[in-house]
């Protein structure tokens, strides 16, 4: 049998937040129902999970011997403190688009972890901003976004924004 | 190492131009708002201008709105002051500094650069 | 805009005594969000400013306990408990509230008695 350590080196996890209770489960990324120390998983989920906080989680199976996978949970922030504005400028809409996360709270997270993507079309920028100009007016342009922390998504978002008519005579 | 290095500073005569740069490094320049303060010769603090993360809004106090503008190039990790129609009072230590957005904090400033305005 | 003013502008203190400092707005720095944008930095002799609180009462990381700060609407304080000689300098409070019109204290500098 292989080590529980070796077996699980390469895990990934998502994570998943409740606005409710403002609290994250971690969904351990694996096929069989594995057990998670003194973290109790169901469906090989942690639950009750506090945004910036770390939490380690022991993992082993029956499948794997000790030692077992030390898995530590880098914990996002909340995802209620960001929101997906349209910065857009009224003068300027019918050939422009300007998409903005804003940090409407603060967090003890390592801001520095934070990765902001914005996919509009098949244009790709890694910015928390972005400006698109020279548009076709009245055309419908479709953004995604998502935000990720340590290179786990923890939110994301789309906007569809259809840009103005043209000024008569343009 | 989180660093902000501002340069650029000089003695310039009234109604002369002068452009400013802050060379950030060690972070993710375009994901952080950024902002220029003063200091003057009273040992005051003024906010000068601020720059969302892309570049897309600018804010200024009156006291030098229309005279100065900030910008920031993020494939080159710089914030930009340009100062024209400078006068005596804008005679000051000048410090960029980082704001994640507007409600948050300045927490890395840079160690400042002189600007005198005289005659 | 919003004026802050400071007081005292100079704070004699012995080494070990408690020191406080106040700050006042010239109206309310409550956003319309429910929180209050008021922060508190430090600048050392030679130095440029250092945050120590942000949100009022939150103390940055790295910020020893002994500093903590309090108020609400348009009066707040900064306590240091114990003072200590690494805490000399000038201290400015500051309003993010009324975005973009971002406005500082005049300063208050600790100094030994």
């Known amino acids: 049998k292989p080590t529980c350590d070796e077996k699980y080196a390469n895990i990934t996890v998502d994570y998943l937040y409740n606005k409710e209770t403002k609290l994250f489960t971690a969904k351990l990324n694996v096929n069989e129902g594995v057990e998670c120390g003194n973290n109790t998983c169901t469906n090989n989920e942690v639950h009750n999970l506090t945004e910036c906080k770390n939490a380690s989680v022991s993992i082993s199976h029956n499948s794997c011997t000790a030692p077992d996978k030390t898995l530590i949970l880098d914990v996002p922030p909340g995802v209620e403190k960001f929101q997906l504005h349209d910065c857009t400028q009224v003068e300027k809409a019918d050939t422009t688009i300007c998409l903005k996360w804003k940090n409407i709270e603060t967090f003890t997270c390592d801001t520095q972890n934070i990765t902001y993507r914005f996919q509009c079309g098949n244009m790709i920028f890694d910015n928390k901003e972005i400006k698109l100009e020279n548009l076709e007016p009245e055309h419908e342009y479709k953004c995604d976004s998502e935000i990720l922390y340590n290179n786990h998504k923890f939110t994301n978002a789309s906007k569809i924004i259809k840009t103005d008519f043209g000024s008569p005579g343009e | 190492e989180v660093q902000l290095v501002e340069s650029g500073g000089d003695l310039v005569k009234p109604g002369g131009s002068l452009k400013l740069s802050c060379a950030a490094s060690g972070f993710a320049f375009s994901n952080y708002d950024m902002s220029w303060v003063r200091q003057t010769p009273e040992k005051r603090l003024e906010w000068v201008a601020y720059?969302?993360?892309?570049?897309?809004?600018?804010y200024y106090p009156d006291t030098v709105k229309g005279r100065f503008t900030i910008s920031r190039d993020n494939a080159k990790n710089t914030l930009y002051l340009q100062m024209s129609s400078l006068k005596s009072e804008d005679t000051a230590m000048y410090y960029c500094?980082?704001?994640?957005?507007?409600?948050?904090?300045?927490?890395?400033w840079g160690a400042g650069t002189t600007v005198t305005v005289s005659s | 805009d919003v004026l802050m003013t400071q007081t005292p502008l100079s704070l004699p203190v012995s080494l070990g005594d408690q020191a406080s400092i106040s700050c006042r707005s010239s109206?309310?720095?409550?956003?319309?969000?429910?929180?209050?944008?008021l922060e508190w930095y430090l600048q050392k002799p030679g130095q440029s400013p250092k945050l120590l609180i942000y949100k009022v009462s939150n103390r940055f990381s790295g910020v020893p306990d002994r500093f903590s700060g309090s108020g609400s609407g348009t009066d707040f304080t900064l306590k240091i408990s114990r003072v200590e000689a690494e805490d000399l300098g000038v201290y400015y409070c500051?309003?993010?509230?009324?975005?973009?019109?971002?406005?500082f204290g005049g300063g208050t500098k600790l100094e030994i008695k």
């Open positions: 109206q309310s720095i409550v956003h319309s969000n429910g929180n209050t944008y």
């Open positions: 720059i969302s993360s892309g570049g897309v809004s600018t």
């Open positions: 500094a980082r704001r994640y957005d507007v409600w948050w904090y300045f927490d890395v």
């Open positions: 500051f309003q993010g509230s009324h975005v973009p019109m971002y406005t």
